[in-house]
Amino acid sequence: PRIVEHPSDVIVSKGEPTTLNCKAEGRPTPTIEWYKDGERVETDKDDPRSHRMLLPSGSLFFLRIVHGRRSKPDEGSYVCVARNYLGEAVSRNASLEVALLRDDFRQNPTDVVVAAGEPAILECQPPRGHPEPTIYWKKDKVRIDDKEERISIRGGKLMISNTRKSDAGMYTCVGTNMVGERDSDPAELT
């Protein structure tokens, strides 16, 4: 047999469905099994209650990605193996990684007092996450447009040059990735 469609790396959120593709050709038609980190993967063919289904095509379908604080049964490196009595073919490795976004910010912004006309800098480090979270800022619950020439956002820093009285307010840093969004504690610019 030979593998004609190899599985691809995937990053997926906990609780979401996903599929690792695999297609094989051969005569006689090969059977397909999946292995994760070297251990055979149980599917609905072994246990009807399984959250993993072996599709007729040979792909592995996850009804929902299961991922706990400690047990992470779906995360790992997968291969599909196609077999018939003439031999076997092994696919390329595909990693299944579970997206993550923690709640706690590595650095919350702190209150800043600045004189009008002076620059102001607010700093933030988003929560740990996978993929690595990006950030944006809100002022008084409204997203800040960083296209305004006085405002620049680089890394975790919000820099306002030549501050005005109208810049005063409550600033919140928002960390975001495919899992969702997390709001920092607000910081007051006075």
Partner: antibody, heavy 118, light 105 residues
Framework: EVQLVQSGAEVKKPGASVKVSCKAS????????MHWVRQAPGQGLEWMGW????????NFPQKFQGRVTMTRDTSITTAYMDLSRLRSDDTAVYYC???????????WGQGTMVTVSS | DIVMTQSPSSLSASVGDRVTITCRAS??????LNWYQQKPGKAPKLLIY???SLQSGVPSRFSGSGSGTDFTLTISSLQPEDFATYYC???????FGGGTKVEIK
């Protein structure tokens, strides 16, 4: 069928050690943490620690540190719990339990009675 | 360590009664709380995980609620097979509550 099957009852003298086994079947052994929980006669459930079958890493509450050892053999999908320097108050039913991806003990062994008596 | 306090330690009830068991954590555990049922001579059985999610195969008369430090297990209409001991467990540090024995009145 997903199940955990434990070794049989043991009778031990004070100061001895006991090793209880837990054979897992019907699921990917290395994907789920294995825990040990004990229950003295007429008492509640007491968590003893966990082993990550993938890495072999372990964690125990302070009460059991230095006296309990948890190991696994992935080739036969079996976890082991070794308790040393046994005392009479270690008399209990010892359970292994699988921790699901929902952070709960969804599959339990049938229990192993360990009696410590002189 | 986070200490889990269950109350009451025992209660008497009749078939058809609504039964409520509470569990209090010594500090916030968000929704990391599970409930188990144990019958004499048997291993515990998972009923509720993540404070309010019903484990597959468990009758819908069992429900869980709460978050933070205060949690409740409710049996809406007690059945003869529900007479057992119930344990809460926090899944951060994994310790169990002391148990609640539900007996026939």
């Amino acid at each position: 069928e997903v199940q955990l099957v434990q070794s049989g009852a043991e009778v031990k003298k004070p100061g001895a050690s006991v090793k209880v086994s837990c054979k897992a079947s019907g699921y990917t052994f290395t994907g789920y943490y294995m825990h040990w929980v004990r229950q003295a006669p007429g008492q509640g459930l007491e968590w003893m620690g966990w082993i990550n079958p993938n890495s072999g890493a372990t964690n125990f509450p302070q009460k059991f540190q230095g006296r309990v050892t948890m190991t696994r053999d992935t080739s036969i999908t079996t976890a082991y719990m070794d308790l040393s320097r046994l005392r009479s108050d270690d008399t209990a039913v010892y359970y292994c339990a699988r921790e699901s991806g929902d952070d709960a003990f969804d599959i339990w062994g049938q229990g192993t009675m360990v009696t410590v008596s002189s | 360590d986070i200490v889990m306090t269950q109350s009451p330690s025992s209660l008497s009830a009749s078939v058809g009664d609504r039964v409520t068991i509470t569990c209090r954590a010594s500090q916030s555990i968000s929704s990391y709380l599970n409930w188990y049922q144990q019958k004499p001579g048997k291993a515990p059985k998972l009923l509720i995980y993540a404070a309010s999610s019903l484990q597959s195969g468990v009758p819908s008369r069992f429900s869980g609620s709460g978050s933070g430090t205060d949690f409740t297990l409710t049996i809406s209409s007690l059945q003869p097979e529900d007479f057992a001991t119930y344990y809460c467990q926090q899944s951060v540090g994994l310790f169990f509550g002391g148990g609640t024995k539900v007996e026939i009145k």
